[in-house]
């Protein structure tokens, strides 16, 4: 393990870089458990989750830390200094291992780059002068005592600070004992800064801000250079206006934040324009919370805070964490600079899902004849882990054969108000596919998620539905089994039809016309509608093989094309049993077993002929009860 | 709204490849759905010769597809069009467009 | 392929005449096609999308209607501006097709 720095005064996760543990087994980071045995000593360590509680961490996994969530707070101690070391001391377990001691070493330091402490300096707090006025700057506003803290205690009284001023003020004067600093005498000491002697005096003349740059280092005895740290950095002086004036609130952007997470409230969220108010004097009150949440102080104990300052606010004190409802909320806030009447503010807080998913509940169907459908709520709908939000959707992977279109235009992004308006529809462009699909990314309140959506073609097919067929029969293929009339007139053309799989048993056939008309039948892989209505197709239905003689089950898969329109696929399911003498059946049969022609006394052979044999039941189909049509598709 | 520019050179040989570019500017070409490009014979009717969608895929009309390749530059904003061995009779002026806007159009001469 | 049709190929009006062109596909485009407006020289415009919705900036002159096969663009009162080719293109089925023109001009 590395050594954790840390800035003074701030709070830093634990990383992967300064704590990390393996095992030879590839252990699973949930796994690996550490368990703090002595807690460090300038600080406290956290859970990003758990910060309120204020209770000491225990234990944390290998996992947290790689999430960040793991945090080591610096509490500022009263007396100043440059460098302090702290140390960490933890078990790793990960049964069945043995356990092993690891200590992590801290180092807090003024030398680091600190975006959330841009002075080197123990205090560089800037001043507030009112307009052509004086002011002293006291080692409460600026104060170099750290870096004589980094010189042994014993040699300290030797030491100073020289502030050497690189630019001067613009707007003022500084004096020390009451003599002007000038490009000539550019030095003060932290002597005289401790002993009071410093003052800004400003010229008067307007409220712009002021301000000086100044580089410190430490001076050793006699006024000589010594090495050791030093910085240079700008003092801002904020100049007042004597007469008092209202604060002016600014807009606020809203907070977003994940259920269960924690975000410090900025400038965007609550700021005020003051001239004459420093941030420490704008206070805050909260008049109604949400329930989605609630406040909180870096270092300011358990629970919800109340009142805060603008103070608390700039330098990142302030922050929320979205323990409630995974609702938007509204912070009603009263804020006064001590001398208005307070101002009602309010901070919205946006709870966002901390995942969504893209729902699929059924691939789009297009209807054959009209090549397009509205997408639905059925193909695309977000869900997270709050009420439904208003999904916008990007295609990341267009269809192959057709196009997505809101209006009548092509378009690639469109939003869940326009899917459940029935204004986004798919459109084949290529006919010459039964189906397509295609990727969106759906995008809601912040998060991602992308889904495929699938497309079929719904034939527009009317197919028998009715009682079984006879075994070793060949029935009459015609539009009372198949019939793709409609589609031939909403196209104006002749559909055609190929099959793609099936009977199991048994074979689709093209008899001839006549008894006159020569050979047998022959093997049909395609036909068209017209090939139907002729008459000119039957259906030999087989026995299945091996097994007994009884009730069967088989069915053909066909492909539908027509001028215009896309394929579609569609299924003829049929039962088979036995053939029965007896029984009327309700398609046209060709041909009948030949056992049951021999058991009638007419051995005849079984090619099938252009009218129905001789012990065909049923010359002309009969409808069946309850009807052997049923309508595949309503347009 | 979207703007379409052609460029590329206004004379070409025979038997060689005709390459012009389309820079898009006012809309991204991985955003509007298609970019096509259209050609117009002098004093004739306008034919669509093929689009790239903004996930980059192509089609092409049947009767050029052999000759023709459109291919996209995200980082430039760009789409090209390429025209394998030309004759005289893909003399035209060539335009770039999107569902609504058209470049407004560069003659192409084949000519030795 | 579709083929487009346009009739009439040309045709002479004044300024505030009626003017109405037909587009014929050979089946049904479902709707999805386009009217275009090309001056000489120039590239042409879109006017017309989806049968019906006029594209933003286009004077309300223009109008579209028609289903299946049969499609008619018309201008309510001829302008000076207006006399130009007219151009259908549908977007039902690939390869997009245009109809031949038609030409209008002052009589």
């Known amino acids: 393990s590395q050594t954790l720095t840390v800035c003074p005064g701030s709070v830093q996760p634990l990383s992967s870089q300064t704590l990390r543990a393996s095992s030879s087994a590839g252990t699973d980071p949930q796994l690996l458990l550490y368990r703090v045995v002595r807690g460090p000593q300038l600080g406290r360590l956290f859970h990003a989750q758990q910060d309120s509680t204020g209770e000491a961490l225990v234990n944390f996994t290998q996992a947290e830390v790689y999430a960040g969530n793991i945090l080591y707070e610096h509490e500022m101690p009263p007396e100043p200094f440059w460098e302090a070391h702290d140390t960490l001391e933890l078990q790793l377990s990960s049964p069945p291992a043995r356990d092993v001691a690891a200590t992590l070493a801290v180092a807090v330091s003024f030398e680091a780059a600190c975006p959330q402490r841009p002075s080197h300096l123990w205090k560089n707090k800037g001043l507030w002068v009112p307009e052509g006025q004086r002011a002293r700057i006291t080692v409460a506003a600026l104060d170099a005592s750290n870096l004589l803290a980094s010189v042994p205690s014993p040699q300290r009284s030797e030491h100073d600070v020289l502030f050497q001023v690189t630019q001067f003020p613009s707007r003022g004067q500084l004096l020390v004992s009451e003599e002007p600093l000038h490009a000539g005498q550019p030095h003060f000491l932290q002597s005289q800064l401790a002993a009071g002697q410093l003052v800004y005096a400003h010229g008067g003349g307007g409220t712009q801000q002021d301000g000086f740059h100044f580089r410190a280092h430490l001076q050793g005895p006699a006024g000589a250079s010594v090495a050791g740290p030093q910085t240079s950095e700008a003092f801002a002086i904020t100049v007042r206006d004597v007469n008092e004036r209202p604060p002016q609130p600014q807009a606020s952007v809203p907070l977003r934040l994940t259920r269960g997470s924690r975000a410090p409230i900025s400038r965007a969220q609550l700021s005020v324009v003051d001239p004459d108010s420093a941030p420490g004097e704008i206070e805050y009150e909260v008049q109604r919370a949400p329930h989605n949440g609630f406040l909180s102080l870096v270092g300011g104990g358990l629970g919800p805070v109340t009142r805060f300052t603008q103070a608390d606010v700039d330098s990142g004190r302030l922050a929320f964490v979205a323990n409630g409802s995974s609702v938007a909320g509204i912070f009603q806030l009263s804020m006064s600079d001590g001398a208005s009447p307070p101002l009602p503010m309010s901070l919205a807080v946006d709870i966002l899902p901390s995942a969504i998913e893209v729902q699929l509940r059924a691939p789009l169907e297009v209807p054959q004849a009209l090549g397009r459908s509205s997408l639905s709520q059925q193909q695309l709908r977000v869900v997270s882990d709050r009420e439904e939000p208003e999904a916008a959707y990007r295609l990341i992977q267009g269809p192959q054969y057709g196009h997505l279109l809101v209006g009548g235009r092509p378009t690639s992004a469109f939003s869940q108000f326009q899917i459940d308006q029935g204004e986004v529809v798919f459109a084949f462009t290529n006919f010459s596919s039964s189906h397509d699909h295609f990727r969106v990314l759906a995008l809601a309140r912040g998060v991602n998620a992308s889904a495929v959506v699938n497309v079929t073609v719904r034939a527009l097919l009317h197919v028998w539905a009715g009682g079984p067929w006879p075994q070793g029969a060949t029935l009459r293929l015609d539009p009372t089994v198949l019939d793709a009339g409609e589609l031939a007139n909403r196209t104006g053309s002749v559909p055609r039809f190929r099959l793609l799989e099936g009977p199991r048993h048994g074979r689709v056939v093209r008899v001839p016309r006549a008894r006159t008309e020569p050979g047998g039948s022959q093997l049909v892989e395609q036909f068209t509608q017209q090939d139907l209505e002729d008459g000119r197709l039957g259906l030999e239905v087989g026995r299945p093989e091996g097994r007994a003689p009884g009730p069967a089950g088989d069915s053909l898969t066909l492909e539908l094309w027509a001028q215009g329109v896309p394929p579609a696929v569609a299924s003829l399911d049929f039962a088979t049993e036995p053939y029965n003498a007896a029984r009327p059946y309700s398609v046209a049969l060709l041909s009948v077993p030949e056992a049951a022609r021999t058991e009638a006394g007419k051995p005849e052979s079984s090619t099938p002929t252009g009218e129905p044999g001789p012990m065909a039941s049923s010359p002309e189909p009969a409808v069946a009860k309850g009807g052997f049509l049923s309508f595949l598709e309503a347009n | 709204q979207v703007q379409l520019q052609e460029s590329g050179p206004g004379l070409v040989k025979p038997s060689q490849t005709l390459s012009l570019t389309c820079t898009v500017s006012g809309g991204s070409i991985t955003s509007g759905y298609y970019w096509n490009w259209i050609r117009q014979h002098p004093g004739k009717g306008l034919e669509w010769i093929g689009y790239?969608?903004?996930?980059?895929?192509?089609n092409y009309n049947p009767s050029l597809k052999s000759r023709v390749t459109i291919s996209r530059d995200t980082s430039k904003n760009q789409f090209s069009l390429k025209l394998s061995s030309v004759t005289a009779a893909d003399t035209a002026v060539y335009y770039c467009?999107?569902?609504?806007?058209w470049g407004q159009g560069t003659l192409v001469t084949v000519s030795s | 392929d579709i083929q487009m049709t346009q009739s009439p190929s040309s045709l002479s009006a004044s300024v505030g005449d009626r003017v109405t062109i037909t587009c014929r596909a050979s089946y049904g485009i479902r709707g999805y096609l386009n009217w275009y407006q090309q001056k000489p020289g120039k590239a042409p415009k879109l006017l017309i999308y989806?049968?019906?919705s006029l594209h933003s900036g286009v004077p309300s002159r223009f109008s579209g209607s028609g289903s299946g096969t049969d499609f008619t663009l018309t201008i309510s009162s001829l302008q000076p501006e207006d006399f130009a080719t007219y151009h259908c293109?549908?977007?039902?089925?690939?390869?997009?097709?245009f109809g031949q023109g038609t030409k209008v001009e002052i009589k």
């Open positions: 467009a999107d569902f609504d806007y």
């Open positions: 989806y049968t019906s």
């Open positions: 790239i969608t903004y996930d980059g895929s192509n």
């Open positions: 293109q549908q977007y039902s089925a690939l390869p997009w097709t």
